[in-house]
């Protein structure tokens, strides 16, 4: 990738990733220094007969920092704090490549849950106010709700009536998403209902 | 019919401030978060942010915080769009649009355009 | 934010020819949404979640792709589809556009 443009680069919390790393063709490359957010990471030199000389300049990573055989960087066991702009400098006798990557780190979801708040009216229809949520969730997760193939809601909260009397059992699916997972939780309404209307009945006797 | 119906054109001076209102109908106003996508003259589409239309909660893309802000009138289920202290280039047409999951726009306002001139 | 570039910037074409328009994302995405805009006009949904056609758009249009490389198809393009067509993706906030393809008469 050239300077100008950032490989834009998804990691998955807590898993590996690879920048990967293109040679200038049939040159011989005389060192190759990676950095992280402009501050040195690791420094190359690879040698022809041996193995190369790897001196990782960043105790912070170090660890969890690891090369192929084409010094594409691996970082394993990725945090949050991972994220931001990588470079590597590839220094030949008669030029220097230099690559970029933007790295973003995406939580896998966990933990889907649904809270009812409902209530039931005198003529019976029942109204349900459901909430969705998952762990840590952040801008980049995506909810609806879903019945019957029909998407109802493009938020985490849905409001919606059902009556007994003249409506089939009824289930509600909230769906979270992003770009690297997807959770899905569903409701009766039938249930939700019932538990409402024995509510109801407790309150009124 | 669901649709969304946007007030009219604005010609604004520079520092001014403008609302823009987006009345929605047909449908669960509350159910469907209500994104603003921007779009100067020649331009392509800018996406500004969305409010959560249960919560009132707004998010903004980077690029839109400050001078501008989204909100809500559940009562007569509308989302108005406020800009203060304006400048030349805020000059674009601004549509609403309703997210139907995945940030899929699947109902947009017939437009409104702003104009910022001296 | 994740950029989209969409190619070709205009594609000249006759009424019956097929037509493919390119959008590619600067990182990994799960889906892309396509949408329609005539002159003076708001976009139109036109496909969803990369392959699903919007209510009332004709079956001469496709959308596929994943990864990085989106693709719309009209197998024959009809007078009324010369417009501009814009990619939207939702996986990373901002949601961005790409800066549309313009479809044209030759």
């Known amino acids: 990738q050239s300077s100008l443009t950032p490989l834009m680069v998804n990691g998955i919390l807590g898993e590996s990733v690879t920048l990967p790393l293109e040679f200038p063709a049939g040159e011989k490359v005389n060192f190759i220094t990676w950095l992280f957010n402009e501050t040195s990471l690791a420094f190359i030199v690879p040698h022809e007969t041996k193995s190369p000389e790897i001196h990782v300049t960043n105790p912070k990573q170090g660890k969890r920092l690891n090369f192929t055989q084409s010094y594409s960087l691996q970082l394993s066991n990725l945090k949050m704090e991972d994220t931001g702009s990588y470079r590597a400098q590839i220094s030949t006798k008669t030029s220097a490549k230099l690559s970029s990557y933007t790295l973003r780190i995406l939580r896998q979801l966990r933990n889907i849950q649904v809270t009812n708040h409902s209530q039931l009216f005198q003529n019976m229809t029942c109204e349900l106010h459901l909430t969705c949520s998952v762990e840590d969730a952040d801008d980049n997760v995506s909810f609806r709700w879903e019945a019957l193939g029909n998407t109802l809601s493009s938020q985490p909260n849905l409001t919606v009536s059902w009556d007994p009397r003249i409506s089939s059992e009824q289930d509600y699916t909230c769906i979270a998403e992003n770009a690297v997972s997807n959770l899905s939780f569903s409701v009766s309404a039938q249930k939700l209902c019932e538990d409402v209307k024995i509510q109801y009945t407790d309150t009124k006797m | 019919q669901i649709q969304l119906v946007q007030s009219g054109s604005e010609l604004k001076k520079p520092g001014a401030s403008v609302k823009v209102s987006c009345k929605a109908s047909g449908y669960t106003f509350t159910n469907y978060g209500m994104n603003w996508v921007k779009q100067a003259p020649g331009q392509d589409l800018k996406w500004m942010g969305w409010i959560n239309t249960y919560s009132g909660e707004p998010r903004y893309a980077d690029d839109f915080k400050g001078r501008f802000a989204f909100s809500l009138d559940k009562s007569v289920n509308t989302a108005y769009l406020q800009i203060s202290s304006l400048k030349a280039e805020d000059t674009a047409v601004y549509f609403c649009?309703?997210?139907?999951?995945?940030?899929?726009?699947?109902?947009w306002g017939q437009g409104t355009t702003v104009t910022v001139s001296s | 934010q994740i950029v989209l570039s969409q190619s070709p910037a205009t594609l000249s074409l006759s009424p019956g020819e097929r037509a493919t328009l390119s959008c590619r994302a600067s990182s990994s995405v799960s889906h892309m949404h396509w949408y329609q805009q005539k002159p003076g006009q708001a976009p139109r949904p036109w496909i969803y979640?990369?392959?699903n056609l919007a209510s009332g758009i004709p079956a001469r249009f496709s959308g596929s792709g994943s990864g990085t490389d989106y693709t719309l198809t009209i197998s024959s393009l009809e007078p009324e589809d010369f417009a501009v067509y814009y990619c939207?993706?939702?996986?990373?906030?901002?949601?961005?556009f790409g800066g549309g393809t313009k479809v044209e008469i030759k």
């Open positions: 939207q993706q939702w996986s990373s906030t901002p949601r961005t």
């Open positions: 979640a990369t392959s």
């Open positions: 649009a309703r997210d139907y999951g995945r940030w899929y726009f699947d109902v």
